[in-house]
């Protein structure tokens, strides 16, 4: 039960995290105009990974895309790449983890396969989260560097007669969304990896033997202490192929129409 909960929670946390990474990547407010210690302007600038925007006091907002690829700073390209890799890995991880969820049965998928898929998705979530955190951190570092550079030569001009105020940029909302989302994806991935350990079957897989009695069938399972009788709705003799004890909620049932997703 704890394994199912851990896996389910890991999936949900990762899902929220990846949604956040996508949102952060699309957001325009990666960097916003620094208003502290600056002349109050009637124009507010903010920039994203894909476009820069200007919001006027009039309420008019104008956004311009970065229509060049080669002219953009290498760091910005690197951040874009990290975020996209994070999203792609996260999306694949989500897809894999859906099939790995214990609460969803696909045919007669082995527990070992589910365990492997859970581990795979967990690793993908961890890498996805790290990519997002790295991308956001690289951008933040770039901002800090530029901030202090522009502060050092904030006022430039000919002989100090004419002043040109350089626009300084500080952390935008997208950075915080990205950090939190990356962290959530990372935590979700760790949870999936933990869940994988609980899902993995025992190392010793004994073949169960079926003894046929004349009256009713009694299957003796070497791995467990419980003898399962043939009494019940299904009176056919059953072969038990899996060794090792199973909890009640793990007893395999015949596939029903609801089992195929």
């Amino acid at each position: 039960m704890a394994v199912t909960a851990c896996q389910g929670l890991g999936f949900v946390v990762s899902l929220i995290g990846i949604a956040g990474i996508i949102a952060a990547t699309c957001m325009d407010q990666w960097s916003t105009q620094d208003l502290y210690n600056n002349p109050v302007t009637a124009v507010f600038n903010y920039q994203g990974l894909w476009r820069s925007c200007v919001r006027e006091s009039s309420g008019f907002t104008e956004c311009r895309g970065y229509f060049t690829l080669l002219g953009l700073p290498a760091m910005l390209q690197a951040v874009r790449a990290l975020m996209i890799v994070g999203i792609v890995l996260g999306a694949i991880g989500l897809l894999v983890s859906i099939f790995a969820l214990k609460c969803i049965r696909i045919g007669s998928m082995e527990d070992s396969a589910k365990a492997n898929m859970t581990l795979t998705s967990g690793i993908m979530f961890i890498v996805s989260g790290l990519c997002a955190i790295a991308g956001v951190s690289v951008f933040a570092n770039m901002l800090v560097t530029n901030f202090w550079m522009s502060t050092a030569n904030m006022y430039t001009g000919m002989g100090g007669m004419v002043q040109t105020v350089q626009t300084r940029y500080t952390f935008g909302a997208a950075l915080f969304v990205g950090w939190v989302a990356g962290g959530l994806t990372l935590i979700g991935g760790v949870m999936m990896c933990i869940a994988c350990r609980g899902l993995a079957p025992e190392e010793t897989n004994y073949k169960a033997v079926s003894y046929h009695a004349s009256g009713h069938s009694v299957a003796y399972k070497p791995g467990g202490f419980k003898a399962s009788t043939g009494f019940g709705s299904n009176t056919k003799n059953k072969k038990i192929y899996d060794g090792g004890a199973r909890t009640e909620d793990e007893v395999q049932s015949y596939p029903s129409k609801h089992d195929y997703v």
């Epitope: 105009q33 002349p39 109050v40 302007t41 009637a42 124009v43 600038n45 903010y46 920039q47 820069s52 925007c53 200007v54 006027e56 006091s57 009039s58 309420g59 008019f60 104008e62 311009r64 004419v162 002043q163 040109t164 105020v165 350089q166 626009t167």
Partner: antibody
Framework: QVQLVQSGSELKKPGASVKVSCKAS????????INWVRQAPGQGLEWMGW????????TYAEEFKGRFVFSLDTSVSTAYLQISSLKAEDTAVYFC???????????WGQGTLVTVSS | DIVMTQSPDSLAVSLGERATINCKSS????????????LAWYQQKPGQPPKLLIY???TRESGVPDRFSGSGSGTDFTLTISSLQAEDVAVYYC?????????FGGGTKVEIK
């Protein structure tokens, strides 16, 4: 078309108060800011400040903080300028203007002359 | 506050001749975010409210005759009336729309010679 219609001229005594109105029509009133501009006789234009009809937020130029108050009645698409404790130097024509894209004043009221005299 | 300095104070030009008004700002009005200069030009005739001619330093307001043109960037701007008409007699103001408080130039009176 966009129109800003201001109230008529006012003659006031020093120390009195005056309220100038600016009625907007031809556009969605809450979408654009209303600015107030003063022009003393024979002088240039002075920006007093503006009010955002969407939020009610106001911004005043330093010399117009205190006795000058901008307000709104969005139900009748009207902006108001109230001046209290009037002084002789407040004698001027007061204009309201709509703040449009490009932070430009694209439409102006006809102006309201406020004369302060004892 | 940003100081807007207009020159000359008054200008007398013959009909059909070119009139040029200059405006200098104490700080750059160029916004790096959209590469626009937040400067507007207004025309005011006696007894009338100002009328917008140019915004973003060089964009002509709709309905304004094309003899009016604006140029310049950063701190230095120019309003040009390519061929002065009798109805152009007025006072012209430049106004910066980038920093609070928004400020106007002192005005330039254009007359016919």
């Amino acid at each position: 078309q966009v129109q800003l219609v201001q109230s008529g001229s006012e003659l006031k005594k020093p120390g009195a108060s005056v309220k100038v109105s600016c009625k907007a029509s031809g556009y969605t009133f809450t979408n654009y800011g209303i600015n107030w501009v003063r022009q003393a006789p024979g002088q240039g234009l002075e920006w007093m400040g503006w009010i955002n009809p969407n939020t009610g937020e106001t911004t005043y130029a330093e010399e117009f903080k205190g006795r000058f108050v901008f307000s709104l009645d969005t139900s009748v698409s009207t902006a108001y300028l109230q001046i209290s404790s009037l002084k002789a130097e407040d004698t001027a024509v007061y204009f309201c203007a709509r703040l449009y894209y490009g932070n430009r004043f694209d439409s102006w009221g006809q102006g309201t002359l406020v004369t302060v005299s004892s | 506050d940003i100081v807007m300095t207009q020159s000359p104070d008054s200008l007398a030009v013959s009909l059909g001749e070119r009139a040029t008004i200059n405006c200098k700002s104490s700080q750059s009005l160029l916004n790096s975010g959209n590469q626009r200069n937040y400067l507007a030009w207004y025309q005011q005739k006696p007894g009338q409210p100002p009328k917008l001619l140019i915004y973003w330093a060089s964009t002509r307001e709709s309905g304004v005759p094309d003899r009016f043109s604006g140029s310049g960037s950063g701190t230095d701007f120019t309003l040009t009336i390519s061929s002065l008409q009798a109805e152009d007699v007025a006072v012209y103001y430049c106004q910066q729309a980038y920093y609070y408080p928004l400020t106007f130039g002192g005005g330039t009176k254009v007359e016919i010679k």
